[in-house]
Interface confidence: low
């Protein structure tokens, strides 16, 4: 069976939207009006992994682009990157672990924990116009909570 996917946008808990910043980076900033069209639309795929009531394994691809968020070690630190894939082979049910995030729902907010690096989360800075990154702390200065907005296909 083909992998189940849905299209969505994400905003952090400060209502910052995610936009492309160069070919392989996302940044978070406040958008209004027509600028909202800049925000990235994700194709969120529901992939194989350990599931519970509030934890769902997903992969986050960029809609109609062969790019996926992935987590790798760079200079020995877990790092978020946008990785190019062969569109003939992705998305798939058995995604490599670097592409997998545990979508965790808490109080109507979402966290995206790296499956490759437990306790590391997709994060944004308090500051405007800064890169989206993989952070190893929750509840600190950096933001790890998001809301999801569905987008029709």
């Amino acid at each position: 069976a083909p992998v189940r996917s849905l299209n969505c946008t994400l905003r952090d808990s400060q209502q910052k939207s995610l936009v492309m910043s160069g070919p392989y980076e996302l940044k978070a900033l406040h958008l209004q009006g027509q600028d909202m069209e800049q925000q990235v639309v994700f194709s969120m795929s529901f992939v194989q992994g350990e599931e519970s009531n509030d934890k769902i394994p997903v992969a986050l691809g960029l809609k109609e682009k062969n790019l996926y968020l992935s987590c790798v070690l760079k200079d020995d630190k877990p790092t978020l990157q946008l990785e190019s894939v062969d569109p003939k082979n992705y998305p798939k049910k058995k995604m490599e672990k670097r592409f997998v995030f545990n979508k965790i729902e808490i109080n109507n907010k979402l966290e995206f924990e790296s499956a490759q690096f437990p306790n590391w989360y997709i994060s944004t800075s308090q500051a405007e116009n800064m890169p989206v990154f993989l952070g190893g702390t929750k509840g600190g200065q950096d933001i790890t909570d998001f809301t999801m907005q569905f987008v029709s296909s």
Partner: antibody, heavy 121, light 112 residues
Framework: DVQLVESGGGLVQPGGSRKLSCAAS????????MHWVRQAPEKGLEWVAY????????YYADTVRGRFTISRDNPKNTLFLQMTSLRSEDTAMYYC??????????????WGQGTSVTVSS | DIVLTQSPASLAVSLGQRATISCRAS??????????MQWYQQKPGQPPKLLIY???NVESGVPARFTGSGSGTVFSLNIHPVEEDDIAMYFC??????????FGAGTKLELK
């Protein structure tokens, strides 16, 4: 060719200390995690400790945590195991092994010949 | 910690026959579709040598007569046909529960 050469073993008194070294060659040492694994005489293998490529992460077996410290010197291509408060049950052949990091799968793909540590009075 | 139970403790086989060594884990070693189980061979006076990783992948340079299989909690190493050079100890190792990597107690392969 990948080569790992351990040194520093020998006879140590109970409660004493010892520092083992592992000299690596034939690969880019600074990009691989490393392990220490030990084997008591006529016994099986026991994983001791792991250190990531840039020393960002260290893991220890419960049996040695707080007594042993794993470290590395990347410019010198050398791995270390500082052992303190040694006990008779630490008597073993100590191997260093390279970690073939693949999708968080801790696999030891190359091993040294080992260095023998005997804890006895 | 995940406990790995190997059986049998020793195994005597004739040259050319099949040797099967089992490794049972106290809990699943599956992680995102991969079985995090390895097999090593150790000859007397030598360090261990990696044979199989992720349950069924044969390490480069290892003869094709070594095969690994299994998933979840039950795994096996098959050697067929057994050659004299295969006489050794064999250990399984799990890497599902990091930071606590564990090995099985080992299986001694002997010639009948």
């Amino acid at each position: 060719d990948v080569q790992l050469v351990e040194s520093g073993g020998g006879l140590v008194q109970p409660g004493g200390s010892r520092k083992l070294s592992c000299a690596a060659s034939g690969f880019t040492f600074s990009t691989f995690g490393m392990h220490w694994v030990r084997q008591a005489p006529e016994k099986g293998l026991e994983w001791v400790a792991y250190i990531s490529s840039g020393s960002y992460t260290t893991y220890y077996a419960d049996t040695v945590r707080g007594r042993f410290t794993i470290s590395r010197d990347n410019p010198k291509n050398t791995l270390f195991l500082q052992m303190t408060s040694l006990r008779s049950e630490d008597t073993a052949m100590y191997y260093c092994a390279r970690d073939d990091y693949d999708v968080s799968n801790y696999v030891m793909d190359y091993w040294g010949q080992g260095t023998s540590v005997t804890v006895s009075s | 910690d995940i406990v790995l139970t190997q059986s049998p403790a020793s195994l005597a086989v004739s040259l050319g026959q099949r040797a099967t060594i089992s490794c049972r884990a106290s809990e699943s070693v599956e992680y995102y579709g991969t079985s995090l189980m390895q097999w090593y061979q150790q000859k007397p006076g030598q360090p261990p040598k990696l044979l199989i990783y992720a349950a069924s992948n044969v390490e480069s340079g290892v003869p094709a007569r070594f095969t690994g299989s299994g998933s979840g909690t039950v795994f096996s190493l098959n050697i067929h046909p057994v050659e004299e050079d295969d006489i050794a100890m064999y250990f399984c190792q799990q890497s599902r529960k990091v930071p606590s990597l564990t090995f099985g107690a080992g299986t001694k392969l002997e010639l009948k």
